[in-house]
Interface confidence: low
C-alpha cells in the first residue's frame, strides 16, 4: 500500500479514503512533494504582505512585504517598517542617527563612523547620518607641499543638503 | 488564537466623523503595539497610526493627522481610531492590526482583522 502512496507526485495527496488514489489537491492547497499524505493550506498574502508569487497545486504562495515595509525572518514571514537614511526603528518609531554614527540604508541600525586614525589614516570627508567618513592618506603620506595646503572641503553628492 | 474584529464603520458625509473600535482576544493586549491601516477601492494597503502598548507613544500618516486619533483601553482589550473631518479620500476598509512585541512597525500575517468599511460619500 505504501508504494502506491509513493507515486502520487506533487500536486496531489495519496486519498486514504479513496483506496488511496492520487486525488489533487483541493483549491488553494498545495503538496510540494510526491507521496503525500495530506496537502498543505496555502499561505495568504494579506494586510501588510502582497502577494510575490500566486499559489500553484505544486508551490506555496510567497509574500512581499507593501510599500514602506521590508520583510523579515524566513520566506517573509514578517515585515518591518522602512526608516530614512540616517535613521534606525527602535521601540519609539525611527530615530535620526546619534552623531558620530550613520546608516545608509532604509533597514537596520546606525552603525560607528570608521576610524580612520587606526588604519593610520585621516579624514578625508567626513562623515554624515547618512553615509561613513571617508578615510585618506596619513598625514605622513602627504608631501611636504600639500601637508601645509588647506584641506579639501567635505564632499557631497547631487541634490545632498549639508548636515 | 489572536482575534481581532473591528466595528464602527459606515457612509458618512464628508466633515463628519466616526469612530472605529477594534477587539482583541488571544493575547496580552497591553504588551503589543497596535495599529490601523486602510485599503482603498483598488488601491494598495496604507499605515495610518499606530500606538504602544501602554499609550504613550503614538504616531500618525501625514494623511491623517491632525484629524484621526489613536486610542486604546487596556482594561478592555479595546483599540479606538476617532476620525474627524472626514473626505473622500478616506473612503476604505480599516484594519487593525497586532504588530510584534520587539518592535514596532513589525507584523506577522496571521494577527490582521477583517475590516470594516467606512465610506465618506455626499
Known amino acids: 500500500l505504501q508504494d502506491l502512496c509513493s507515486n502520487c507526485p506533487a500536486g496531489t495527496f495519496c486519498d486514504n479514503n479513496r483506496s488511496q488514489i492520487c486525488s489533487p489537491c483541493p483549491p488553494n492547497s498545495f503538496s510540494s512533494a510526491g507521496g503525500q499524505r495530506t496537502c498543505d493550506i496555502c499561505r495568504q498574502c494579506k494586510g501588510v504582505f502582497k502577494t510575490r508569487k500566486e499559489c500553484s497545486s505544486t508551490s506555496n504562495a510567497e509574500c512581499d512585504c507593501i510599500s514602506g515595509y521590508h520583510c523579515l525572518g524566513a520566506e517573509c514571514s514578517m515585515c518591518e517598517q522602512d526608516c530614512k537614511q540616517g535613521q534606525e526603528l527602535t521601540k519609539k518609531g525611527c530615530k535620526d542617527c546619534c552623531f558620530g554614527t550613520f546608516n545608509d540604508q532604509k533597514r537596520g541600525i546606525c552603525r560607528p563612523w570608521t576610524n580612520c586614525s587606526l588604519d593610520g589614516k585621516s579624514v578625508l570627508v567626513n562623515g554624515t547620518k547618512e553615509r561613513d567618513v571617508v578615510c585618506g592618506p596619513s598625514p605622513a603620506d602627504l608631501s611636504p607641499g600639500a601637508s601645509s595646503a588647506t584641506p579639501p572641503a567635505p564632499a557631497r553628492e547631487p541634490g545632498h543638503s549639508p548636515q | 488564537e489572536v482575534q481581532l474584529v473591528e466595528s464602527g464603520g459606515g457612509l458618512v458625509k464628508p466633515g463628519g466623523s466616526l469612530r472605529l473600535s477594534c477587539a482583541a482576544s488571544?493575547?496580552?493586549?497591553?504588551?503589543?503595539?497596535m495599529s490601523w491601516f486602510r485599503q482603498a477601492p483598488g488601491k494598495g494597503l496604507e499605515w495610518v497610526s499606530h500606538i504602544s502598548g501602554s499609550g504613550t507613544t503614538i504616531d500618525y500618516a501625514d494623511s491623517v493627522k491632525g484629524r484621526f486619533t489613536i486610542s486604546r483601553d487596556n482594561a478592555k482589550n479595546s483599540l479606538y481610531l476617532q476620525m474627524n473631518s472626514l473626505r473622500a479620500e478616506d473612503t476604505a476598509v480599516y484594519h487593525c492590526?497586532?504588530?510584534?512585541?520587539?518592535?514596532?512597525?513589525?507584523?506577522?500575517?496571521?494577527?490582521w482583522g477583517q475590516g470594516t468599511l467606512v465610506t465618506v460619500s455626499s
Open positions: 488571544g493575547f496580552a493586549f497591553s504588551d503589543y503595539y
Open positions: 492590526a497586532r504588530e510584534d512585541s520587539r518592535m514596532p512597525g513589525t507584523t506577522d500575517f496571521d494577527n
